[in-house]
Interface confidence: medium
């Protein structure tokens, strides 16, 4: 599923991401935009043999199990394919674990490069939340 901007903002808010660990909803929507272009089925392969999955491009080396990533830790204890569902529950729950890990949203390269320090509230402007 490819979410609309406000549709995703509403879904993320419903799942408790607004101000989770101090990160406003705009940060999460911005991250999803530049990680996956709001596409729940996005997959991207990395040079280390791991793959990033879903709307928040969660990595198989650390967070999920895709059955083929050397030394995978599967810290979210889920199959990576669960992160590709049109229901974003699994991605959100795993993202909450990631953002609580110490580096906050710096874990997402796209957030670090494209969202951090910008007017992220623009990503939820005009949305009925």
């Amino acid at each position: 599923k490819v979410f609309g901007r406000c549709e995703l903002a509403a879904a993320m808010k419903r799942h408790g991401l607004d101000n989770y660990r101090g990160y406003s909803l705009g940060n999460w929507v911005c991250a999803a935009k530049f990680e996956s272009n709001f596409n729940t089925q996005a997959t991207n392969r990395n040079t280390d043999g791991s793959t990033d999955y879903g709307i928040l491009q969660i990595n198989s080396r650390w967070w999920c199990n895709d059955g083929r990533t050397p030394g995978s830790r599967n810290l979210c204890n889920i199959p990576c394919s669960a992160l590709l569902s049109s229901d974003i529950t699994a991605s959100v729950n795993c993202a909450k674990k990631i953002v609580s890990d110490g580096n906050g949203m710096n874990a997402w390269v796209a957030w670090r490069n494209r969202c951090k320090g910008t007017d992220v509230q623009a990503w939820i402007r005009g949305c009925r939340l």
Epitope: Q41, T69, L84
Partner: antibody, heavy 116, light 107 residues
Framework: QVQLQESGAEVMKPGASVKISCKAT????????IEWVKQRPGHGLEWIGE????????YYNEKFKGKATFTADTSSNTAYMQLSSLTSEDSAVYYC?????????WGQGTTLTVSS | DIELTQSPATLSVTPGDSVSLSCRAS??????LHWYQQKSHESPRLLIK???QRVSGIPSRFSGSGSGTDFTLSINSVETEDFGMYFC?????????FGGGTKLEIK
Amino acid sequence: QVQLQESGAEVMKPGASVKISCKATGYTFSTYWIEWVKQRPGHGLEWIGEILPGSGSTYYNEKFKGKATFTADTSSNTAYMQLSSLTSEDSAVYYCARGDGWYCYWGQGTTLTVSS
Amino acid sequence: DIELTQSPATLSVTPGDSVSLSCRASQSISNNLHWYQQKSHESPRLLIKYASQRVSGIPSRFSGSGSGTDFTLSINSVETEDFGMYFCQQSNSWPRTFGGGTKLEIK
């Protein structure tokens, strides 16, 4: 136990298309990548590409883009590879395998012969 | 693409001999190298994963070693059932690639 069962041998004419199937049993089909591999005598093994059945995500070896198309049906736990515009170069044994990085589980292979 | 070069192309041995098969990668692939055996008209069978991890059910006479670009599959005291083709495969990057194979034949 994990098993991959491929469809039977095919004899096709040049220019035609063929669809090979790979039925998986013994594991959660949607969560593992299915890989496709080509073997021709004297050419060794070639990786064609892969599909993640749960999402339909696909990756192709550049060499096979436009030649191979992958699909999967999670209701029947079956992956498919369609090969189009067949030529004699496509005559080979085609394998599906479960993609764990390594390939512990293979289908028995489908022999494709392209001949006029 | 990462090229895998296997040598020798053919190895003629007598049962009871010990042999070493080589696989060399065109660039470093850490330990992301796997070995397969294939007998005529059969699917490949995984022997060793991640350069040195013997797969369940594979006899202890098979062992693997190496890291980076140079890898070796060793068979200690070859048995008649070991004759066939041996392939290496890398999973360090895409596209996945295989070596050209080493044929192990009876002398």
